[in-house]
């Protein structure tokens, strides 16, 4: 009798048992126990998965597969030799000991073994194919990795060279900046020195100009006095000649009063025969204190003492109480004569005030007050005006009755605000009122909708900042 049994031993290896009469043949087939199960991330004897992420792992696995393949190959060779050897012996025994019908069983066993061998061979072929496939993929991957690595290396090299270039450039620029800083410092120093020199020069020139102005005024005065003296002498000579030629003449001496050399205002200068507009020295009433003023000897008969002038914004009119009291600026350009002088002057005689205005469109207008005076400092130089005529509005743009004078540091207005700070400049602010000729100077095309400009409401309306203004006074009886 014979039978054929397939089973698994305690170690999990497959075994084939052939029972043939008293003889029992056991075949132990090799297991690919190094191969991982299909639950593993890398399947064995299954559809090829993506290449592993870890290159080292792939290499290791490839080596294991190669070892298995080698083992299987060796075992097959041993099995072949074993079968051949044993088959020879068995065949001899069979021929010797076994009857005819056992040949069939042996053929069956042989066939079975051959089938198993074929199956094992197929399996090995599959494994070989997989291994080849995997090897090819790994080779490709290695190639790609190599290419990628080369690219990265190239990029790194490029970047390194770029960085080096940038560093060189940076160093070059840093050096350039340092050089420029050095040059700049030198230039600054040089400019500072030049500035200092220029300032010294300017101050020298200013003092020279002042001296020249004084000399000019003195010369002008002297010249006019000489002309007047010459004129008087001529008259005296003529009168003497007349007297001498007259039969009833008595010898007499012409007694002349001493020439006036100090003037309280420009009207006196004009009456003395000096009729050219310019800067003259005036003397405070009942005092020897002097002040320089611009005398307008042309407008409306001349003799006007200019107390304020604006024309180009070259002088800052946002000044202190003291500055407005004593005066500031240049009589040749923009200036404020001084509240104290004007107060003293207008407190002794009756004066008229003329205000001349120019807009940016080429128009001119004026306001004339037939009585003007300023109260003393104890009354904050309050302004008093009556009798308005002129072309710059029928209503006075200086609030009536007159307001106290206010500056940025002396708030005497009637506003809950501080008008001088809000509108800029010192003025007879009300709350704040329709005018401010000492406001911020604005150039053309920037002179409308201004809250702090040079304002004369009843001529140009609100927010219009004027181009030029002049305030001048003259005795009412001139």
């Amino acid at each position: 009798y014979s039978n054929f049994r397939k089973s698994v031993d305690s170690t999990g290896r497959r075994q084939y048992q052939v029972q043939n009469g008293p003889c029992s043949y056991t075949f132990l087939l090799p297991e690919t126990d190094s191969c991982r199960s299909s639950s593993s991330p890398y399947m064995s004897n299954a559809v090829q998965r993506d290449a592993p992420l870890d290159y080292d792992d792939s290499v290791q696995r490839l080596q294991v597969l190669e070892n298995i393949l080698e083992n299987n190959t060796q075992w097959l060779m041993k099995l072949e030799n074993y079968i051949q050897d044993n088959m020879k012996k068995e065949m001899v025994e069979i021929q010797q000991n076994v009857v005819q019908n056992q040949t069939a069983v042996m053929i069956e066993i042989g066939t079975s073994l051959l089938n198993q061998t074929a199956a094992q061979t197929r399996k090995l072929t599959d494994v070989e194919a997989q291994v080849l496939n995997q090897t090819t993929r790994l080779e490709l991957q290695l190639l790609q990795h190599s290419i990628s690595t080369n690219k990265l290396e190239k990029q790194i090299l490029d970047q390194t060279s770029e960085i080096n270039k940038l560093q060189n450039k940076n160093s070059f620029l840093e050096q350039k900046v340092l050089d420029m800083e050095g040059k700049h410092s030198e230039q600054l120093q040089s400019m500072k020195e030049q500035k200092d020199e220029l300032q010294v020069l300017v101050s020298k020139q200013s003092s020279v100009i002042d001296e020249l102005e004084k000399k000019l005024v003195t010369a002008t005065v002297n010249n006019s006095l000489l002309q007047k003296q010459q004129h008087d002498l001529m008259e005296t000579v003529n009168s003497l000649l007349t007297m001498m030629s007259s039969p009833n003449s008595k010898s007499s001496v012409a007694i002349r009063k001493e020439e006036q050399t100090t003037f309280r205002d420009c009207a006196e200068i004009f009456k003395s025969g000096l009729t050219t507009s310019g800067i003259y020295t005036l003397t405070f009433p009942n005092s020897t204190e002097e002040i320089k003023a611009y005398c307008d000897m042309d407008v409306g008969g001349g003799g006007w003492t200019v107390i304020q002038h604006r024309e180009d914004g070259s002088v800052d009119f946002q000044r202190t109480w003291k500055e407005y009291k004593e005066g500031f600026g240049s009589p040749l350009g923009e200036y404020w004569l001084g509240n104290e002088f004007v107060s003293q002057l207008t407190g002794q005689h009756r004066y008229v005030l003329k205000i001349q205005l120019k807009d940016w469109e080429g128009n001119e207008a004026h306001s004339l007050y037939d009585h003007f005076y300023l109260a003393g400092e104890e009354s904050n130089y309050r302004i008093h005006l009556t009798g308005l005529t002129g072309t710059a509005g029928k209503i006075s743009s200086i609030s009536q009755p007159g307001s106290d004078f206010s500056t940025k540091d002396s708030d005497n207005d009637k506003c809950i605000c501080k008008c001088s700070q809000m509108l800029s400049g010192g003025w007879w602010f009300d709350a704040c009122g329709p005018s401010n000729l000492n406001g911020q100077y604005y150039p053309q095309k920037q002179n409308t909708n201004k809250f702090n400009g040079i304002k004369w409401y009843y001529w140009k309306g609100s927010g219009y900042s004027l181009k030029a203004t002049t305030m001048m006074i003259r005795p009412a009886d001139f």
């Epitope: 809950i416 008008c419 809000m422 009300d430 709350a431 704040c432 009122g433 909708n449 809250f451 609100s462």
Partner: nanobody, 129 residues
Framework: EVQLVESGGGLVQPGGSLRLSCAVS????????IGWFRQAPGKEREGVSA????????YYADSVKGRFTISSDNSKNTVYLQMNSLRPEDTAVYYC??????????????????????WGQGTLVTVSS
């Protein structure tokens, strides 16, 4: 640069309504009072209404009380004049103007016209049937 731009004027029948807008730029309404003025042909410019303190204080001329309402939207820097029950005598060019809110005489609530230093170009309102 301070700018005021009026809009919303037009032709309206007597009894009708109009809403004027005054868009302000270059200043903030928090610090300024805005007034509406009007000038009819051949007449002096007159004050109509004014607003300050974010609408906390408003002023109306007697001739428009109960008919006109002034309001402001500080987020848009715009002041409005809602005019209802319009009459032919309301026909005029309407201007808006600005004045620093603090420029007030002690004891007074509103500002003389000469204190308004920034003005718009005006918008014409015609009330006619």
């Amino acid at each position: 640069e301070v700018q005021l731009v009026e809009s919303g004027g037009g032709l309206v029948q007597p009894g009708g309504s109009l809403r004027l807008s005054c868009a302000v730029s270059g200043i903030t309404l928090d610090d300024y009072a805005i007034g509406w003025f009007r000038q009819a042909p051949g007449k002096e410019r007159e004050g109509v209404s004014a607003i300050r303190d974010n609408g906390g204080s408003t002023y109306y001329a007697d001739s428009v009380k109960g008919r006109f309402t002034i309001s402001s939207d500080n987020s848009k820097n715009t002041v409005y004049l809602q005019m209802n029950s319009l009459r032919p005598e309301d026909t005029a060019v309407y201007y808006c103007a600005a004045v620093p809110a603090g420029r007030l005489r002690y004891g007074e609530q509103w500002y003389p016209i000469y204190e308004y230093d920034a003005w718009g170009q005006g918008t014409l309102v015609t009330v006619s049937s």
